[in-house]
Interface confidence: low
């Protein structure tokens, strides 16, 4: 692998639609993992500082962004679905976490060269009770 | 896996102001029901998965579209699937 | 926007006590999460701890027992108190706040914490 061509990923979290919730009760939660490269990378989602399985859903592999180029940067997306009334407590805090491996020339966290390095990369929502 | 009560549906969902990603879910629709890869390169959809809420005893399917696209939209998100015409969820414009 | 401004922050023996202050401004009333959290020359920035809306807590193992998280909600200001300080205290102390819809994150400029005899 070219140690020299490595991109951390950008993650968004997107809140549930209005819609979603009205109709089934439910409301989903979408992490973006998007841009990352090579492909190493474990995603997360924590509610209230603690991990949580129940109700994720995630890619089972990366999504290559353009398919066409050998050395395409990478993309992977989970859900996360509660309850409209867990999603709608305002006190409710829902973190996606992505842990990103590699080495690069110009990060700031790489000091041993030796070693993969982790970077820990997230992107939070808390329960929305209004705007 | 089976899934009892499928309600399928397009949903958008919304980032940050400053995020000019659009994502598209696709949910709740029947397990015979595949999702087709888009044929624009700007436009990434996910493979489906399987969710289960295993409080509530409830699985469902779903996947997820994205692009930087601005005329992306979630109407045409999935166009190369087949999807009924009832599926879609206008996103409610903001109040805040 | 958010403005953090952080202060309390000094040298201190082993032992010894300190209370940061976080004073937020702007648009407090859309944060309903505060955090301090620390780095230590040539170490990766970590929490110490968290207060959320409601006034829950959350500590890092390292200030269980030690470090009280907490906020004056009339004055927006964020407090840790620091006691039974150790040499591996020693750090830049910031204080985070998060607003009701992510990623709007903001961070303050950090206050010295020396923890030495």
């Known amino acids: 692998e070219d140690l020299k061509k490595v991109f951390p990923p950008k993650v968004a979290v997107f809140e549930p639609s209005e819609a979603e919730i009205s109709h089934t009760q439910k409301a989903t939660l979408v992490c973006l993992a998007t841009g990352f490269y090579p492909d190493h990378v474990e995603l997360s989602w924590w509610v209230n500082g603690k991990e949580v399985h129940s109700g994720v859903s995630t890619d089972p592999q990366p999504l290559k962004e353009q398919p066409a180029l050998e050395d395409s940067r990478y993309s992977l997306s989970s859900r996360l679905r509660v309850s409209a009334t867990f999603w709608h407590n305002p006190r409710n805090h829902f973190r996606c976490q992505v842990q990103f491996y590699g080495l690069s020339e110009d990060d700031e966290w790489t000091e041993d060269r030796d070693k993969p390095i982790t970077q820990k990369i997230s992107a939070e929502a808390w329960g929305r009770a209004d705007c | 896996p089976y899934i009892q009560n499928p309600d399928p549906a397009v949903y958008q969902l919304r980032g940050s102001k400053s995020n000019d990603t659009s994502v598209c879910l696709f949910t709740d629709f029947d397990s015979v029901m595949n999702v087709s890869q888009s044929k624009d390169s700007d436009v990434h959809i996910t493979d489906k998965t399987v969710l289960d809420m295993r409080s509530m005893d409830f699985k469902s399917n779903g996947a997820v579209a994205w692009s930087n696209k601005s005329d992306f939209a979630c109407t045409s998100a999935f166009k190369d699937s087949v999807i009924p015409a009832d599926t879609f969820f206008p996103s409610p414009e903001s109040s805040c | 926007e958010v403005q953090l401004v952080e202060s309390g922050g000094g040298v201190v023996q082993p032992g010894g006590s300190l209370r940061l202050s976080c004073v937020a401004s702007?648009?407090?009333?859309?944060?309903?999460?505060y955090g301090w959290y620390r780095q230590a020359p040539g170490k990766e920035r970590e929490k110490v701890a968290h207060?959320?809306?409601?006034?829950?807590?959350d500590y890092a193992d390292s200030a269980k027992g030690r470090f009280t998280i907490s906020r004056d909600e009339s004055k927006n200001t964020v407090y840790l108190q620091m006691n039974s300080l150790r040499p591996e205290d020693t750090a830049l102390y910031y204080c985070?706040?998060?607003?009701?819809?992510?990623?709007?994150?903001?961070w303050g400029q950090g206050t010295l914490v020396t923890v030495s005899s």
């Open positions: 702007g648009y407090v009333h859309k944060i309903n999460f």
């Open positions: 207060i959320s809306i409601g006034d829950q807590t």
């Open positions: 985070r706040a998060l607003s009701r819809i992510w990623p709007y994150d903001y």
